[in-house]
């Protein structure tokens, strides 16, 4: 088992909004849960965009999930990752 490296980034979207992207990379096996939580509960699936789980060329995998949020409400969002029985949460950077 190779645990993922998780990285959260933010980019400007429309006025007053930002897109936050959570990337998991260099993990094996390929089964992974990667999702955004808002206010501690599941963020509706139709407000999230997922990338495919793809090989990254080193025998491991990578994927991502993104969502658009209001600027100033970053604290309410966390990226949740679960892989091979381990889990972690990752805040949006300031």
């Amino acid at each position: 088992t190779v645990p993922p490296m998780v990285n959260v980034t933010r980019s400007e979207a429309s006025e007053g909004n930002i897109t936050v992207t959570c990337r998991a990379s260099s993990f094996y096996p390929r089964n992974i849960i990667l999702t955004w939580r808002q206010d501690g509960v599941s963020l509706a699936h139709d407000t999230q965009q997922w990338g495919d789980v793809l090989p990254d060329g080193n025998g491991t995998y990578q994927t991502w999930v993104a969502t658009r949020i209001c600027r100033g409400e970053e604290q309410r969002f966390t990226c949740y990752m679960e892989h091979s029985g381990n889990h972690s949460t990752h805040p949006v950077p300031s």
Epitope: R37, D39, G40, V41, T78, Y80, G85, T89, P91
Partner: antibody, heavy 119, light 107 residues
Framework: DVQLQESGPGLVKPSQSLSLTCTVT?????????WNWIRQFPRNKLEWMGY???????NYNPSLKSRISITRDTSKNQFFLQLISVTTEDTATYYC????????????WGQGTLVTVSA | DIQMTQSPASLSASVGETVTITCRAS??????LAWYQQKQGKSPQLLVY???MLADGVPSRFSASGSGTQYSLKINSLQPEDFGSYYC?????????FGAGTKVEIK
Amino acid sequence: DVQLQESGPGLVKPSQSLSLTCTVTGYSITSDYAWNWIRQFPRNKLEWMGYINYSGTTNYNPSLKSRISITRDTSKNQFFLQLISVTTEDTATYYCSYYRYDGAWFPYWGQGTLVTVSA
Amino acid sequence: DIQMTQSPASLSASVGETVTITCRASGNIHNYLAWYQQKQGKSPQLLVYNAIMLADGVPSRFSASGSGTQYSLKINSLQPEDFGSYYCQHFWSFPLTFGAGTKVEIK
């Protein structure tokens, strides 16, 4: 460590308002987290009532939405529960608690305060 | 709303026994589940979060499992301090709801 302490009257008359205070020590309620009220009825059923978060946003249980208000006093690091038009069905032990945004589970609770609704 | 159904409502067991408590959700909660222990006259205490993760300080005789709509809490080699009531709680969506509880009593 975050510590929470509930306070308020132990007896309320039917049709009146129930008002409780949660005093938080060890953490600023404006820094982070969702600050919640949960109640436990005499037969032990637990009900999540609602929260006010670090920025003052509230979220209530729809079953209580027309009767509940959660507010705060940031200068005293307190948050409050008001429940209007109470009936004997609102007799319960009321707890305050909080959760972090990594998941809406409750790591610590206050000791609880029993409120009896009776004429 | 998602309803949480716990079973059994109560059970009697002896010190050293293994007991299992189950919790069924009315919809898929995708492991968004917590377990609490409550002793008489005390506040609930967090045991498990994210369906399987033991909270800080919880003894390793406790374990939890499940997925989808079915979850369980297992206590191996029951100790005197384990007697009390146990509740599950989902956090998949609002409103957050709890199971009705399982009372674990001394046989």
